[in-house]
Interface confidence: medium
């Protein structure tokens, strides 16, 4: 499988909500010995490899935000977490995988990475990530709603397999 990022750039006004999305394309293994681990984190455009640095999103680490299940199951973080930090990560049966951030502030700007790891208990592993940028703007030049910019086909597939 691979991960695509439908949009590479989100430009949003302060106070708005934004949902950043990754999409898993292709077959995901099924079986009792298969684990799918998905998460989100903030990163930077590293010189060696994008998304290799992991920073918290609103003080929540990639461990706090992870989803864990088998195959293309639906899952999401608790509403309690969303209420306390204005964040919710979710995935559906169709491979869509998102994080919603409520009441954006300028501090939310940055490079967001989604990570999907498929482990067939230590026989093999497949790890993919996608990256997208969020720019939160304020003032008269800020858009009234989020404006999203589609990824080029080259950028939208970020495949890293071990």
């Amino acid at each position: 499988f691979k991960v695509t990022t439908p949009y590479s750039l989100y430009v949003c006004p302060e106070g708005q909500n934004a949902t950043l999305t990754c999409r898993i394309l292709g077959p995901v293994s099924k079986g009792h010995d298969v684990t799918i681990y998905k998460t989100w984190y903030l990163s930077s455009r590293g010189e060696v490899q994008m998304c290799s640095e992991r920073r918290p999103i609103r003080n929540l680490t990639f461990q706090d935000l992870h989803l864990h299940h088998g195959g293309h199951q639906a899952a999401n973080t608790s509403h309690d977490l969303a209420q306390r930090h204005g964040l919710e990560s979710a995935s559906d049966h169709h491979g869509n995988f998102s994080i919603t951030m409520r009441n954006l502030t300028l501090l939310d700007s940055g490079l967001y990475c989604c990570l999907v790891v498929e482990i067939r208990h230590h026989h093999s592993e497949h790890r993919v990530h996608g990256a997208m940028e969020l720019q939160v703007q304020t003032g008269k030049d800020a858009p009234s709603n989020c404006v999203v910019y589609p990824s080029s086909s080259q950028d939208s597939e970020n495949i890293t397999a071990a």
Partner: antibody, heavy 120, light 112 residues
Framework: EVQLQQSGPELEKPGASVKISCKAS????????MNWVKQNNGKSLEWIGN????????TYNQKFKGKATLTVDKSSSTAYMQLKSLTSEDSAVYYC?????????????WGAGTTVTVSS | DVVMTQTPLSLPVSLGDQASISCRSS???????????LHWYLQKPGQSPKLLIY???NRFSGVPDRFSGSGSGTDFTLKISRVEAEDLGVYFC?????????FGGGTKLEIK
């Protein structure tokens, strides 16, 4: 067979540093976090931290930040832990342990342990 | 840090008896994703710990079905339905819901 082979016992003087190793075999080394656990006097267990061997990303127990440094060498499937500014409090058995589910925090394979003794 | 409190410290049993070990956490171990990351290990004398139960009630591969885990929130129990000689050692509960991961102080299962 999945194995974690740890380096031998170490006797060090206070103030010194020590680097212990954990060589993985029989599985995809980069597929799971490698954890390090300290055991005092055969009783309590303390989680020191872990490292994602693929990215080299580390998560530490705040208590061991500045004391322990975790690294990996992917080419030899080996994880390392360096302990610095040793004191008698660091005398313990140190285990490396593989995360069963990538990064979920339960460990299905453990090394045999490396005994570190700090004594003048 | 989450404090894991195990009781009893020592549990003398006769072979064939049922044994029960309690583990209590200082805060809920329900992760934001709904899973509860509470695990049990057995450490036999002179050996490394071995995983018995993960995520409250899932027996690790090769672990006999006389071992069972239960509980929720902050209170968890490991039960051994019929103790055998090979079950003797120190049992540790552990949580990985919150970083840093923490372990209980251990319960020593010994022959009466």
């Amino acid at each position: 067979e999945v194995q974690l082979q740890q380096s031998g016992p170490e006797l060090e003087k206070p103030g010194a540093s020590v680097k212990i190793s954990c060589k993985a075999s029989g599985y995809s080394f980069t597929g799971s976090n490698m954890n390090w656990v300290k055991q005092n006097n055969g009783k309590s267990l303390e989680w020191i931290g872990n490292i994602d061997p693929y990215y080299g990303y580390t998560t530490y127990n705040q208590k061991f930040k500045g004391k322990a440094t975790l690294t990996v060498d992917k080419s030899s499937s080996t994880a390392y832990m360096q302990l610095k500014s040793l004191t008698s409090e660091d005398s313990a058995v140190y285990y490396c342990a593989r995360d069963y589910d990538y990064a979920l925090g339960y460990f299905d394979v453990w090394g045999a342990g490396t005994t570190v003794t700090v004594s003048s | 840090d989450v404090v894991m409190t195990q009781t009893p410290l020592s549990l003398p049993v006769s072979l064939g008896d049922q044994a029960s070990i309690s583990c209590r956490s200082s805060q809920s171990l329900v992760h934001s994703n709904g899973n509860t990351y509470l695990h049990w290990y057995l450490q036999k004398p002179g050996q490394s710990p071995k995983l018995l139960i993960y995520k409250v009630s899932n027996r690790f591969s090769g672990v006999p079905d006389r071992f069972s885990g239960s509980g929720s929130g902050t209170d968890f129990t490991l039960k051994i339905s019929r103790v055998e000689a090979e079950d003797l050692g120190v049992y540790f509960c552990s949580q990985s819901t919150h970083v840093p991961y923490t372990f209980g102080g251990g319960t020593k299962l010994e022959i009466k």
